[in-house]
Amino acid sequence: HTAAQDNCTCPTNKMTVCSPDGPGGRCQCRALGSGMAVDCSTLTSKCLLLKARMSAPKNARTLVRPSEHALVDNDGLYDPDCDPEGRFKARQCNQTSVCWCVNSVGVRRTDKGDLSLRCDELVRTHHILIDLRHRPTAGAFNHSDLDAELRRLFRERYRLHPKFVAAVHYEQPTIQIELRQNTSQKAAGDVDIGDAAYYFERDIKGESLFQGRGGLDLRVRGEPLQVERTLIYYLDEIPPKFSMKRLTA
């Protein structure tokens, strides 16, 4: 079992319903919205998390929309279609039959079309650049200490191997975290960089997805690291296909 057995909860995803109805009375957790069983020893896929987020009652929602700066999805939140593994389906459509193609992190990568739009494959996002600006501090953080702390965070909290943290750049007050993960490099059981980036983004915004875990308290040598602005850029293995009209807008 991977859920917390004693009180049957999902430590890695609070947007679940858990009950001891698994094999041998083991705790089993299902994501809200999709009802899909999730592995609570690792991160839940972004697609299932977005679906759960959209299914939450509007009046009880404790999670807020991304800020105007977030480049996760310029189109804002949507209720995605997920495949049986919890990944985004390559083609997403809304209730008014407007469709578009997305990448593996669910970000639109084509112009919007109608139901005839074809999305042949789910294109993998293999490079994510997380751009942070921290609040003013007495002095700059030591670069190697900052690098070590961020790698520890991604390893221990998000279970992302440091080999997928390609680099940590720092020019006060800007921190850039580069996540890279080619299809060939990602082994079974490896956390996807898109899922790790999403959990990190939500943690930074004070909207932690973890069950009963304190909010993110980032410290470098005891000094609090408080983020005041986040931008996330996605690079796909195949470049996106937008019309020139959008590119020149």
């Epitope: 917390a4 890695t12 070590a148 790698r151 440091p162 080999k163 082994a187």
Partner: antibody, heavy 118, light 111 residues
């Protein structure tokens, strides 16, 4: 400063089990997973597995599945490793350790010497 | 599992001379410019002590006579000049892939 304090040496009979401990101090215990490493004359250093101090779940080296069981007690900042059905091949020094930024072993316990003998 | 082959198994060097220890991995341990290879020193009765991380980065407090080099599958630890205090066993370790694995060790003695 970061310290990992391990339990004392053990002399046990073949076939029994033993549980060794590793108490962490000088850092936030749940911020770091605890790894266990075996050192024997025959096989140099071998990674046994890791337990998440926060989640409480363990990942084992295939070779030690069924031999080692790792647990953690957050309230006392202590990790435990139980070794079952002991044989002379389990005689070794067992270390607990914490990882650094690039998954090198940054901090080590002083080691627990296990001798299995009839 | 990634197998690390260290050579030589033992090494006798005169004080003030150079000691070179080699570690070969069964597959590449590099990822996006980072080599996930590390070196440790172990003295009798003590746990291993980190000397060099990521192939060539000297751990804080380690004397500059220790240096590491290499990439992909071939790595080297160099001690120059060797001092009496360097008598120990040296291990390489890869952390590119689970399970982490160690080399068989190289015992350094003074000639």
């Amino acid at each position: 400063q970061v310290q990992l304090q391990q339990s004392g040496a053990e002399l046990v009979r073949p076939g029994v089990s033993v549980k060794i401990s590793c108490k962490g101090s000088g850092y936030t215990f749940t911020d770091y997973s605890i790894h266990w490493v075996k050192q024997s004359h025959a096989k140099s250093l071998e990674w046994i597995g890791v337990i998440s101090s926060y989640y409480g779940d363990a990942t084992y080296n295939q070779k030690f599945k069924g031999k080692a069981t790792m647990t953690v007690d957050k309230s006392s900042s202590t990790a435990y490793m139980e070794l079952a059905r002991l044989t002379s091949e389990d005689s070794a020094i067992y270390y607990c350790a914490l990882l650094g930024a690039y998954n090198y072993f940054d901090y080590w316990g002083q080691g627990t010497t296990l001798t299995v003998s009839s | 599992d990634i197998v690390l082959t260290q050579s030589p198994a033992s090494l006798a060097v005169s004080l003030g001379q150079r000691a070179t220890i080699s570690c070969r991995a069964s597959e590449s341990v590099d990822s996006y410019g980072n080599s996930f290879m590390h070196w440790y020193q172990q003295k009798p009765g003590q746990p291993p002590k980190l000397l060099v991380y990521r192939a060539s980065n000297l751990e804080s407090g380690i004397p500059a006579r220790f240096s590491g080099s290499g990439s992909r599958t071939d790595f080297t630890l160099t001690i120059n000049p060797v001092e009496a205090d360097d008598v120990a066993t040296y291990y390489c370790q890869q952390s590119y892939e689970d399970p982490p694995t160690f080399g068989g060790g190289t015992k350094l003695e003074i000639k």
